[in-house]
Structure formats: structure tokens, C-alpha cells
Interface confidence: low
């Protein structure tokens, strides 16, 4: 149990789910959607899904891509439908403080996100909206 005041549910989005962790489901709900690519025993493993706990999603989405793994995150219903993660090419730098977004996919860095892809503040990350 936590000492802090209980929080209400975070706002969640419908996401495409693909991969072993999805079971029989083709969708899931999470505070962030993701698309990932990892190298496992020489094989390319593509996955799509949700981060349901905001802190978990933030940590993973903030992790810069490495030669063996890349994760792209977004916020918005079905926003990961057309995202395919790509491993970084040599000579291209990716600051660890930024979301890894590919320019050609019209996705931009966390600081510049707007519209449907807008990242919401901690205060707004609540599923029930108090006014």
C-alpha cells in the first residue's frame, strides 16, 4: 500500500496488440501504446501493445534505442496501428530524454507532440476527470 492520497484511474487508450503477450486478443487498453522491435537469437521480434502503468511506459519509452531493441510509444486510440519500430542506423544519435520517433512516419519528439499524439501532464493522467 502507498502512503500518498489514492489516485483515480488514468486515462487509457485503445491500442493494437500483436505478439505473445497479447494471448488471443488483438487489442488492449493502456496509457500509452507501443510498437517494438528486438533482436532475439538473431531473429527480429516485432510486438505491439500497451503500457498500462504510466511509470512503466514512461521508463520504457524514454529508453533510447540500441542495436538490439527499439520501442516507439504514442498516446491516442489505435495510434500504434501504423507504427513499425526500426533499429537505429550507425552514426545516428538518439538522446535518451526523447521518445524515439521516425521522421518519415510523421511522429515527432515528446517535447513537440501535439494534437492526437499530445503527451498529457501528470495531473491530467487520470481516468476520471475532476472539475
Amino acid at each position: 500500500m502507498e502512503d500518498e492520497k489514492p489516485k483515480v484511474n488514468p486515462k487509457l487508450y485503445m491500442c493494437v496488440c500483436e505478439g505473445l503477450s497479447c494471448g488471443n486478443e488483438d487489442h488492449c487498453e493502456g496509457q500509452q501504446c507501443f510498437s517494438s522491435l528486438s533482436i532475439n537469437d538473431g531473429f527480429h521480434v516485432y510486438q505491439k501493445g500497451c503500457f498500462q502503468v504510466y511509470e512503466q511506459g514512461k521508463m520504457t519509452c524514454k529508453t533510447p534505442p540500441s542495436p538490439g531493441q527499439a520501442v516507439e510509444c504514442c498516446q491516442g486510440d489505435w495510434c500504434n496501428r501504423n507504427i513499425t519500430a526500426q533499429l537505429p542506423t550507425k552514426g545516428k544519435s538518439f538522446p535518451g530524454t526523447q521518445n524515439f520517433h521516425l521522421e518519415e512516419q510523421k511522429l515527432i519528439s515528446e517535447e513537440d507532440l501535439g494534437g492526437e499524439q499530445k503527451l498529457i501532464s501528470e495531473e491530467d493522467l487520470h481516468h476520471h476527470h475532476h472539475h
Partner: antibody, heavy 115, light 107 residues
Framework: QVQLQQWGAGLLKPSETLSLTCAVY????????WSWIRQPPGKGLEWLGE???????NYNPSLTSRVTISVDTSKNQFSLKLPSVTAADTAIYYC?????????WGQGTLVTVSS | IQMTQSPSSLSASVGDRVTITCQAS??????LNWYQQKPGKAPKLLIY???NLVPGVPSRFSGTGSGTDFSFTISSLQPEDIATYYC?????????FGGGTTVAISR
């Protein structure tokens, strides 16, 4: 697909404590909020409260002083306790997994309070 | 927040267009869900965010609305649609449901 299986005593006497447990299968316990909802025979749905995997709870103010929801993440289970029951607590009780909507439901447990 | 659903019951023929309304006691943006409950079964989520169909739900079901007034439509009523339908908001706590609308087939 997430599956919820619930159990608990179905027949209680007035003043006894209602106790139900819901087990979660095929789903990440941290992926959802976990709620209890009840439905008196022939009537509508009433949300009782919710809990997440960290034990954060929110309750319906109409029952706050009575209802307790707890979680056991090691067993992927969550529970409902409602003390001092009366005939007005007779209902089908459902456990549910939800984010924006109640996406997955338990099979329901009819709890009858009768002397 | 009170959710007022109407009508409480209705009867229609197979193939008819059926509309149910739900009114919130205050502005809830589009934070509204619709459920179908068949006798002896748990409710099933059909529509979230007022108008978004849950994957796998037939396209004859639809929802519209924002603010305080919402509607749920079955474009062509089928025998398997016989059930009670509930709206539910998630704008604030406590989460509350409408009183339900029971849909029957008229002979």
C-alpha cells in the same frame, strides 16, 4: 483473453459479513483497475468500488463506510468485504476488469440476505 | 453524476431501427460507455468514448453524443439483440450507470 472467476458465500443472515473473491487469469494484474459491481434482482447496476495492483482504492460514497476491497497480487486475486448486511444487499455481485470501460466480467455471484 | 436513460423499455420488429437515449446530470464530455446485458449473463461492453465500437461488436450498433446528451442506435434490430442496454459514465467518481433499457421483439 482475460478471465475472471469469482466465489464466496451465497446465503447470509442479516448482520453477517459478505465476502467475495475474484481470481484473474490470462491477464497482467497491473494492466487494469479491478472493480466490484452489484445488481439487485431485476434492477440496474451499481458500482461499489475499485482497486489497482498497488492497492489504491476508490469507493462509491454511498457505501464508503462499509465496503472494503483488497488485493493479493501474489495470487492475482482481489476481494470484497461488506459487513453488517441487510436484505437491501441482496444482489448479483460481479467482479470486473476495467480501464475506460468494464471490459471483462466475472460470472456473477448471487448473494441472498435472509433471516 | 446521475445518468437518466429512456425509454425504460421498448418493443420493435426485426429489422427496425432502435434508438436509446442517455442524459447526464452534468457535462461529461464523451466519457460514456454502452453495455448489453442478456438475461442471466454479465454485461458486455459495446461502445466506449460515446461512439467507438469495441472490436468484434457488429457495426449495426453505434453511439453518438457529447456533453450531456447521448444516444445509442441499433440500425437493424436482430433477434439476438434482445437484451437490456445500459449507459455508464467515467467522467468522475463514483462511476454510475443509467437505469437500463430493455429491448424486446414485437410480434
Amino acid at each position: 483473453q482475460v478471465q475472471l472467476q469469482q466465489w464466496g458465500a451465497g446465503l447470509l443472515k442479516p448482520s453477517e459479513t459478505l465476502s467475495l473473491t475474484c481470481a484473474v487469469y490470462n491477464g497482467s494484474f497491473s494492466s487494469y483497475y479491478w472493480s466490484w459491481i452489484r445488481q439487485p434482482p431485476g434492477k440496474g447496476l451499481e458500482w461499489l468500488g475499485e482497486i489497482n495492483h498497488r492497492g489504491r482504492t476508490n469507493y462509491n460514497p454511498s457505501l464508503t463506510s462499509r465496503v472494503t476491497i483488497s488485493v493479493d497480487t501474489s495470487k492475482n486475486q482481489f476481494s470484497l468485504k461488506l459487513p453488517s448486511v441487510t436484505a437491501a444487499d441482496t444482489a448479483i455481485y460481479y467482479c470486473s476488469a476495467h480501464t475506460r470501460g468494464f471490459l471483462y466480467w466475472g460470472q456473477g455471484t448471487l448473494v441472498t440476505v435472509s433471516s | 453524476i446521475q445518468m437518466t436513460q429512456s425509454p425504460s423499455s421498448l418493443s420493435a420488429s426485426v429489422g427496425d431501427r432502435v434508438t436509446i437515449t442517455c442524459q447526464a446530470s452534468q457535462d461529461i464530455n464523451n466519457y460514456l460507455n454502452w453495455y448489453q446485458q442478456k438475461p442471466g449473463k454479465a454485461p458486455k461492453l459495446l461502445i466506449y468514448d460515446a461512439s467507438n465500437l469495441v472490436p468484434g461488436v457488429p457495426s449495426r450498433f453505434s453511439g453518438t453524443g457529447s456533453g450531456t446528451d447521448f444516444s445509442f442506435t441499433i440500425s437493424s434490430l436482430q433477434p439476438e439483440d434482445i437484451a437490456t442496454y445500459y449507459c455508464q459514465h467515467y467522467y468522475d467518481l463514483p462511476l454510475t450507470f443509467g437505469g437500463g433499457t430493455t429491448v424486446a421483439i414485437s410480434r
